[in-house]
């Protein structure tokens, strides 16, 4: 059975509008229905209608369709405002250009290429023919309008009123020639509704066949009308989701306007010495970020790969390595020539109006009041007022509503890692924004004025299973499997969540991974009774530069004698130097006949300064790192141990204080190991666990 196509994409929608007929002779047909889609299907097929349907109105209050043989351009009709009405006009009847060969063209051009008036289709004078409206139903052979009922090569044509010229093509342009855009088409508001390969675009207000976040009501300024090509997210050119279930989206073939002029409203005020607004019009030659690090050239991919190239962002003046703001960021910025610092803001450029805008944040950004409204992964922020319920769920005080305006990045919950926002994407409820800390800002992001040294352990009783303290158990240890082989360690911190390292995920296909819990042997030998094998359903990447990942399990682990969770430390806590800790892993042991059993190496905590000395001053540790040296020379984490934990004990409580990440050498004698400091990221971990949905057991 042929699947009925959804034809609403063939209509232009005018919200809160209806048509009133002034000419009483005009017919109308009405019927009760549930959705506008049903109206559209009937209009397109003309099923049960005594006329050719050109438009319809959907009455949302009465759940009723009104089908019309006319549209807003017809005589004897006027448009009227009406809250409960939505007008849908078949695009074929209002389009003044053709797609492909123009088979679907139903416009009102009635003059040929050389200027001869067309002969009416129902007439046999001056030329007899077989193209009768009754023989070509649905081809709209009305009046003397140009048509292409057989889809012939030259496009729409007609028999002419000149007896000497039997027929001639009409000069109707291709829609792709009529439509043009400036720059990368962010301001394009034209009527192109199909992709460069000819696929019909999906309506922005529909979620089938592709679910998406670009809802017209959420982004009223993006021009998400009907199913027209748009560029809401800074792509190289306009695009749309397609009606092909196998092709999520595609670019549209819209040429660049000949004179490349922009509307006055689109042109940012150009400045060379200072920043106006967010500095999108800054065209000066400053080429270092705030702390003096030189900028990378925009046309270079070294040391940082990116897509902010002059080719992709025309009109943004991405010359040389000058600070620019091509993407609507907080202020001009650039990629840096330091391989360890991807981007930086050029916040040393003065504001033309000193009271306007903010380029960066101080401390943890809780007082940041700039107007960036995009996450680091490019998702558009959703309005704060739509998310207050969620916000109240994870903070225990009343947020300052005066700061939470629009959908700007803010930090209402005192997050240590800077401003963030909600996204409206159910899989990624919130994320951080790409904003740097201000020049010379030394405010610590962890502020603990009441307690200069916070204990890492939470004051609670040690849990006991079957009368044996769980401290003898390593049930929180996870073997992350990649294509059936152990690749990394991890720590079970909650039934559905594993803390591990970013580098442990070489493939983007989550089907390539499994988590093994409750095992002692890396191959699971002898662990059959206690082993739990769980699939991975999502990866949540940690704050920028953290190298952490929270891995969500497809179903919660069952806690028993062999599988348990490990505690997290208090946020911002300090563990005393010389505290004895352990690293666990199934990684490289240096032994030829490795038995595959879980190994432990005993380390002790070392202060950051002392640690730096042991690394001959080549490494400077920051507040997000923790250092631990080996009691036994040459023991410590290595390949296969990455993602695993540094476990320490305080007040008889075991906690994961560090995560093993690549890049710090492999159990090098006299070189202490440097780990990601979990205490620094503890609030982020709690926030993810609290805000991300997990499957119920």
């Amino acid at each position: 059975q042929r699947k009925r196509r959804n034809t609403i994409h063939e209509f232009k929608k005018s919200a809160k509008t209806t048509l009133i007929k002034i000419d009483p002779a005009l017919k109308i047909k009405t019927k009760k229905v549930n959705t506008a889609d049903q109206c559209a299907n009937r209009c397109t097929r003309n099923k049960g209608l005594p006329f050719t349907c050109k438009a319809f109105v959907f009455d949302k209050a009465r759940k009723q369709c009104l089908w019309f043989p006319f549209n807003s351009m017809s005589s004897g009709v006027k448009k009227e405002f009406g809250h409960e009405f939505d007008l849908y006009e078949n695009k074929d009847y209002i389009r003044n250009c053709i797609i492909g060969k123009g088979r679907s063209y139903k416009g009102t051009v009635s003059i040929t290429k050389s200027g001869i008036k067309c002969q009416p289709w129902s007439s046999m004078i001056p030329h007899e023919h077989s193209f009768l409206p009754s023989s070509y139903r649905g081809k709209d052979l009305q009046e003397n309008y140009c048509r292409n009922p057989r889809g012939e090569e030259g496009g729409p044509w007609c028999f002419t009123s000149n007896p000497e010229v039997r027929y001639e093509v009409c000069d109707i342009p291709q829609c792709s020639e009529v439509e043009c855009m400036t720059c990368n088409g962010e301001s394009y508001r034209g009527l192109m509704d199909h992709t460069e390969s000819g696929k019909i675009c999906q309506r922005w207000d529909h979620q089938t066949p592709h679910r998406h976040k670009f809802l017209p009501e959420r982004y009223p300024d993006k021009g998400f009308d009907d199913n027209y090509c748009r560029n809401p997210d800074g792509q190289p050119r306009p695009w749309c989701y397609t009606l092909d279930p196998h092709t999520r989206w595609e670019y549209c073939a819209i040429k660049t306007c000949a004179d490349n002029t922009m509307n006055d409203t689109d042109v940012p005020l150009e400045t060379t010495e200072c920043i106006q607004g967010q500095g999108e019009g800054y065209r000066g030659t400053v080429n270092t970020i705030w702390n003096g690090i030189p900028c990378q050239r925009w046309d270079s991919q070294y040391p940082h790969e990116h897509d902010m190239t002059p080719e992709n962002f025309k009109c943004k003046d991405l010359r040389e390595n000058y600070c620019r703001n091509p993407d609507g960021s907080e202020s001009p910025w650039c990629f840096t020539t330091d391989p360890n610092i991807r981007v930086g803001y050029c916040s040393q450029i003065p504001n033309c109006d000193m009271s306007h805008g903010q380029d960066c944040y101080r401390g943890n950004g809780k007082n940041y009041m700039g107007n960036l409204s995009q996450t680091r992964s490019g998702l558009t922020c959703s309005m704060w007022d739509k998310n207050m319920e969620d916000l109240h769920r994870h903070i225990f005080w009343e947020p300052d509503a005066s700061k939470l305006n629009e959908n700007y990045c803010r930090n209402p919950d005192d997050d240590a890692h800077g401003p963030w926002c909600y996204t409206g994407n159910p899989l990624i409820p919130w994320d951080y924004c790409p904003i740097s800390r201000c020049e010379g800002d030394t405010t610590p992001t962890i502020v603990n004025l009441d307690h200069p040294v916070i204990s890492c352990a939470k004051t609670k009783q040690l849990r006991v299973v079957n009368g044996i303290p769980t401290r003898t158990n390593i049930g929180w240890m996870v073997s992350l499997r990649y294509r059936n082989k152990h690749i990394c360690g991890g720590s079970l911190i909650k039934e559905s969540w594993v803390l591990t390292a970013r580098q442990c995920f070489p493939s983007r296909d989550l089907k390539d991974y499994e988590a093994w819990l409750g095992i002692h042997d890396v191959h699971g030998r002898g662990d059959e009774k206690c082993k739990q094998v769980l699939n991975v359903s999502q990866l949540v990447y940690g704050p920028e530069g953290s190298d952490l990942v929270l891995m969500k399990l497809a179903r919660p682990a069952v806690l028993d004698d062999f599988v348990s969770t490990i505690d997290l430390p208090n946020y911002g806590c300090t563990i005393p130097e010389k505290t004895s800790c352990s690293v666990y892993g199934w990684g490289y042991t240096g032994l030829i006949n490795y038995d595959g059993l879980l190994r432990v190496a005993h380390l002790y905590i070392m202060g950051n300064e002392k640690c730096s000395q042991h690394h001959r001053g080549k490494v400077t540790l920051n507040e997000s790192e923790i250092c631990a040296g080996a009691e036994k020379i040459g023991s410590g984490p290595c390949e296969g141990d990455y993602g695993g934990p540094l476990v320490c004990e305080q007040h008889k409580m075991r906690m994961v204080l560090g995560v093993i990440v690549p890049g710090r050498g492999c159990a090098i004698p006299n070189r202490p190991g440097i780990f990601v400091r979990v205490a620094y990221y503890a609030k982020w971990i709690h926030k993810i666990i609290l805000t991300y949905k997990v499957p119920q057991s």
Epitope: S507, R508, D509
Partner: antibody, heavy 119, light 110 residues
Framework: EVQLVESGGGLVQPGGSLRLSCAAS????????ISWVRQAPGKGLEWVAV???????DYASSAKGRFTISRDNSKNTLYLQMNSLRAEDTAVYYC?????????????WGQGTLVTVSS | DYQMTQSPSTLSASVGDRVTITCQVS??????LSWYQQKPGKAPKLLIY???TLASGVPSRFSGSGSGTEFTLTISSLQPDDFATYYC????????????FGGGTKVEIK
């Protein structure tokens, strides 16, 4: 200068072994995934093997069980140990740097080394 | 398994022509696709990654599009320097993969 230089190619008999080397300069081999890609005379590119930042490896079905990819961080060098060589392994072998720590696109290539398997 | 099918295998064109090469993947890879250009006796050169992002120093006449399973490389106006072989490569996963590259498209002078 950031570059990759392959060596170790040559003529080898069917069933024989060969070890290719790829010396990196300007970056460390342990900070990126690195791959071997080969091209038989007059044929297209064929991916052979990859070693990721965490040390895990992947192989194309044609290389599985016969080839081993490894690296020596102290020498900043990548290797491909090829055993049980067949005539169809004759190709130019390129070593290529993968962007970031996992599977991705290749943003730096060596000049290639020719391996000929023939009796 | 991600099978890569590139078409056509050979394409004859003239300078100034608009050239389109397609790459089909047996299952969805989102936008994780790259395009390379290779000239005889040389190593391949990265042209486009993430389906549509131009690599550094690549002329703007090259463009990439598509997502999911269908991808296209377009050269808007073929130049003498563009006669070469072009390959697509999936950058999604190498799980049970025979080859991460497409079979190649040779663009030759008409």
């Amino acid at each position: 200068e950031v570059q990759l230089v392959e060596s170790g190619g040559g003529l080898v008999q069917p069933g024989g072994s060969l070890r290719l080397s790829c010396a990196a300069s300007g970056f460390t081999v342990s900070s990126n995934a690195i791959s071997w890609v080969r091209q038989a005379p007059g044929k297209g590119l064929e991916w052979v093997a990859v070693i990721y930042v965490v040390g895990a490896t992947d192989y194309a079905s044609s290389a599985k069980g016969r080839f081993t990819i490894s690296r020596d961080n102290s020498k900043n060098t990548l290797y491909l140990q090829m055993n049980s060589l067949r005539a169809e392994d004759t190709a130019v072998y390129y070593c290529a740097r993968v962007y970031d720590s996992g599977w991705n696109h290749f943003n730096l290539w060596g000049q290639g080394t020719l391996v000929t398997v023939s009796s | 398994d991600y099978q890569m099918t590139q078409s056509p295998s050979t394409l004859s064109a003239s300078v100034g022509d608009r050239v389109t090469i397609t790459c089909q993947v047996s299952q969805s890879i989102s936008s994780w696709l790259s395009w390379y250009q290779q000239k005889p006796g040389k190593a391949p050169k990265l042209l486009i990654y993430r389906a549509s992002t131009l690599a550094s120093g690549v002329p703007s006449r090259f463009s990439g599009s598509g997502s999911g399973t269908e991808f296209t490389l377009t050269i808007s106006s073929l130049q003498p320097d563009d006669f070469a072989t072009y390959y697509c490569q999936q950058a999604y996963s190498v799980s049970n993969v025979d080859n991460a590259f497409g079979g190649g498209t040779k663009v030759e002078i008409k």
